[in-house]
Interface confidence: medium
């Protein structure tokens, strides 16, 4: 289109000089060179619309969005952000181009979004879109969901106070154990905050946003299930809400449920009951015990009793601060090259941990599984038989925990050799750590059986990259061996490897590699 103006969109990053910066055109800042945002005409748009490349800005950074318009005559303009109009004062540069600027000082989450610039020139009207986002997610949070009773209704609301606003979903399962795994067909997901169907076997609420996904299970005592060998334990921090569900099924309605804390009935307002008939006409009753904000004195044994079932208890422990309990002593493992093996860490923690496994500066996802005894376990099997140091790191809102593991792979040595003007060196990475022998090859010893003992220096050095041990042996050159072939051999319980070196001039001259099993 001949009539369309030539538009240039640029981003100017400012290095703040700790001065207070006004929105005038002469800000006391050091500016970086402008970055072209390549304003492109948006196809299939009603009206003339240009779109600038997306802009990512660090928190607290200051920037200017600038548009240069090569169009004759005067222009008027308006910036719009979050449906609100912002002042716009065009001016003209030395080349008589219209210049429109938007200064964003000390970028915050509230200033991120879409900035629209409406321009009217004598010839035409057009719109320019800038999308500005914050580069890092330091302002983002993902908090574990918690439950609240819905006002005047027998329903639970799931709340996660997170930024950005999370998607909340209920994860329901009506079968037992393994079949309640996340992707199992027995699992039903409901993307809503309020749940009315509270009779299911397993009820969890999950919240997810850009930072990931956090879930909270509705702690349940099922009077129809055989009690666990160890008493179930529930940890909470002071101020958090307590929710325990007691569930029982009986052939008819002639039974009742009650909650007691340390043999005292719970106060009115700290419990509510629901009942329903199941498909086989048996009666299901559930009784919730809840405290909207727990204090230290809410600690104790919560017992659910029924007139028709044996009672069951859970120990509720209220703590001031979260914790991670596990043994942090480092552990060393030695395995064969094809042996199946997993690292594992057993821990007790509250709130639930976030964890990673790290090897050679690379992080791997960490899965955790709850055990019946209140402990959890995290296993790592994806080591691909690479020897070295593996690190398990866990943290929650209040605590951090790190545990080191060393993995050694049993294998016969492999030898590498190099020589200089004054010495010859051999290196090996086998495990167990090999021992060394040096032999001289001569007319008298064509099979290289003449052992060299003088001038040999053995050491082990930690090869930092993988944390594994590398052994080395160095032979200092003497007149007696100059010009001869020498052989270095590394041996351990799994075998021997040798390398032959010609000792005449500087440089590595590995001649023959022998592999002797």
């Amino acid at each position: 289109n001949q009539d369309l103006p030539v538009i240039k969109c640029v981003l100017i990053n400012h290095k703040n000089n700790d001065s207070s910066v006004g929105k005038s055109s002469s800000y006391p800042m050091v500016s970086e060179s402008p970055e072209d945002l390549g304003c492109a005409l948006r196809p299939q748009s009603s009206g003339t619309v240009y779109e600038a490349a997306a802009v990512e800005v660090d928190v607290s950074a200051s920037i200017t969005l600038q548009v240069l318009v090569d169009a004759p005559g005067n222009i008027s303009c308006l910036w719009v952000f979050k449906h609100s109009s912002l002042n716009c004062q065009p001016h003209f540069d030395l080349q008589n181009r219209g210049v429109v600027s938007m200064v964003i000082l000390k970028m915050t989450e509230t200033q991120a979004g879409e900035y629209l610039l409406f321009i009217q020139s004598e010839a035409t009207n057009y719109t320019i879109l800038f999308t500005v986002s914050i580069r890092n997610t330091l302002l983002y949070t993902l908090r574990r969901p918690y439950f609240r009773k819905m006002e005047n209704q027998d329903a639970l609301v799931c709340i996660s106070e997170s930024v950005p606003e999370p998607i909340v979903e209920w994860v329901l399962c009506d079968s037992q154990g393994e079949s309640c795994k996340e992707e199992s067909p027995a699992v039903v997901k409901k993307e809503e905050k309020v749940l009315h169907e509270l009779f299911g076997t397993d009820i969890r609420c999950c919240a997810r946003n850009e930072l990931g996904r956090e879930c909270t299970r509705l702690f349940t005592i099922d009077l129809n299930q055989t009690p666990q060998t160890t008493l179930p334990q529930l940890f909470l921090k002071v101020g958090e809400p307590l929710w325990i569900r007691c569930k029982a099924v009986h052939v008819n309605h002639g039974f009742g449920l009650t909650w007691e804390l340390e043999n005292k009935a719970l106060e009115e307002g700290n419990y509510f009951e629901m009942s329903t008939y199941s498909t086989n006409r048996t009666m299901i009753r559930i009784l919730f015990a809840f405290v909207s904000s727990v204090a230290r004195n809410d600690t104790g044994y919560y017992t659910c009793s029924s007139s028709k079932h044996p009672s069951q208890s859970a120990l509720v422990t209220i703590v001031e601060k979260g914790f991670i309990n596990a043994t942090n002593s480092s552990e060393d493992y030695e395995i064969d090259q094809y042996e199946e093996f997993c690292f594992s860490v057993r821990f007790k923690a509250y709130p639930q941990i976030r964890c990673t496994w790290t090897f050679s500066r690379k992080s791997f996802p960490c899965e955790q599984k709850g055990l019946d005894n209140g402990y959890s376990i995290s296993k790592f099997c994806n080591h691909k038989h690479q020897p070295g140091e593996y690190i398990f790191h866990a943290e929650n809102d209040d605590a951090q925990f790190t545990k080191m593991f060393t993995l050694n792979i049993r294998r016969k040595p492999q030898v590498l050799a190099e020589a200089s003007a004054s010495q010859a060196s051999c290196f090996s990475d086998g495990y167990p750590l090999p021992s060394w022998t040096w032999k001289k090859c001569s007319d008298k010893s064509p099979n290289c059986t003449e052992e060299i003992t003088e001038g040999v220096w053995n050491r082990k050095a930690n090869r930092k990259v993988f944390g594994q041990w590398v052994s080395s042996s160095t032979l200092n050159m003497s007149e007696a061996i100059k010009g001869f072939l020498v052989k270095c051999c590394a041996y351990n319980s799994l075998g021997t490897s040798c390398e032959t070196i010609l000792l005449n001039s500087p440089g590595p001259f590995p001649f023959i590699q022998d592999n002797i099993s």
Partner: antibody, heavy 121, light 108 residues
């Protein structure tokens, strides 16, 4: 000259949802802001949120966040406002209004005729 | 959010008289992005003034707006019979947009 024509009156039960449409005829549609404003019987005007259809840029008033969804279909030149979890106090006339950018403003210069939504059990 | 307070709540005047309506903002309204609307019973609002002082297309010159920052005024120099209605101010310079509660201009 732009005209905004809204869908007809609705009677809804508490807890349900309502979706009101606003169709633009004449003039440019996509690059102009469309606001939704409601007015309860005998009360003042209350801004609920707005959309700039061409970009899908949506802003909601805090009061309605999570309950209102504003969308637009450029191909049919129609904006929509859906309000969920209706309660009796949501009984009101719901207006759509188009912003004017002429003279570099942004105020709403064109209004729909209004849609009465009655929430009653 | 910016809260707009209009005064008086009701203004009782006769045709030919001058009407002065006030709109006060809890925070400064950026760049005078303040509008005035007129609404008659059973009708949609109609834009009178934008940018605090600019008259919208087709609005008679007896309507004028003034003010900046936090204090704004709508003046109707000589009331005509068709001017008796409810008047709302609205700020659109700071998210979210907000309206005043309205001033009713009624016949005395």
């Amino acid at each position: 000259q732009v005209q905004l024509v809204q869908s007809g009156a609705e009677v809804k039960k508490p807890g349900s949802s309502v979706k009101v449409s606003c169709k633009a005829s004449g003039g440019t549609f996509g690059s102009y802001g469309i606001s939704w404003v409601r007015q309860a019987p005998g009360q003042g005007l209350e801004w609920m949120g707005g959309i700039i259809p061409i970009f899908g840029t949506v802003t909601y008033a805090q009061k309605f966040q999570g309950r209102v969804t504003i969308t637009a279909d450029e191909s049919t030149r129609t904006a929509y406002m859906e309000l969920s979890s209706l309660r009796s106090e949501d009984t009101a006339v719901y207006y759509c209004a188009r912003d004017s950018w002429s003279g570099a403003t942004g105020a709403s210069d064109t209004w729909g005729q209004g849609t009465l939504v009655t929430v009653s059990s | 959010e910016i809260v707009l307070t209009q005064s008086p709540g009701t203004l009782s005047l006769s045709p030919g008289e001058r009407a002065t309506l006030s709109c006060r903002a809890s925070h400064s309204v950026s760049s005078s992005y303040l509008a005035w609307y007129q609404q008659k019973p059973g009708q949609a609002p109609r834009l009178l003034i934008y940018g605090a002082s600019s008259r919208a297309t087709g609005i008679p010159d007896r309507f004028s707006g003034s003010g900046s920052g936090t204090d704004f005024t709508l003046t109707i120099s000589r009331l005509e019979p068709e001017d008796f209605a409810v008047y709302y101010c609205q700020q659109y310079g700071s998210p979210p947009r907000t309206f005043g509660q309205g001033t009713k201009v009624e016949i005395k």
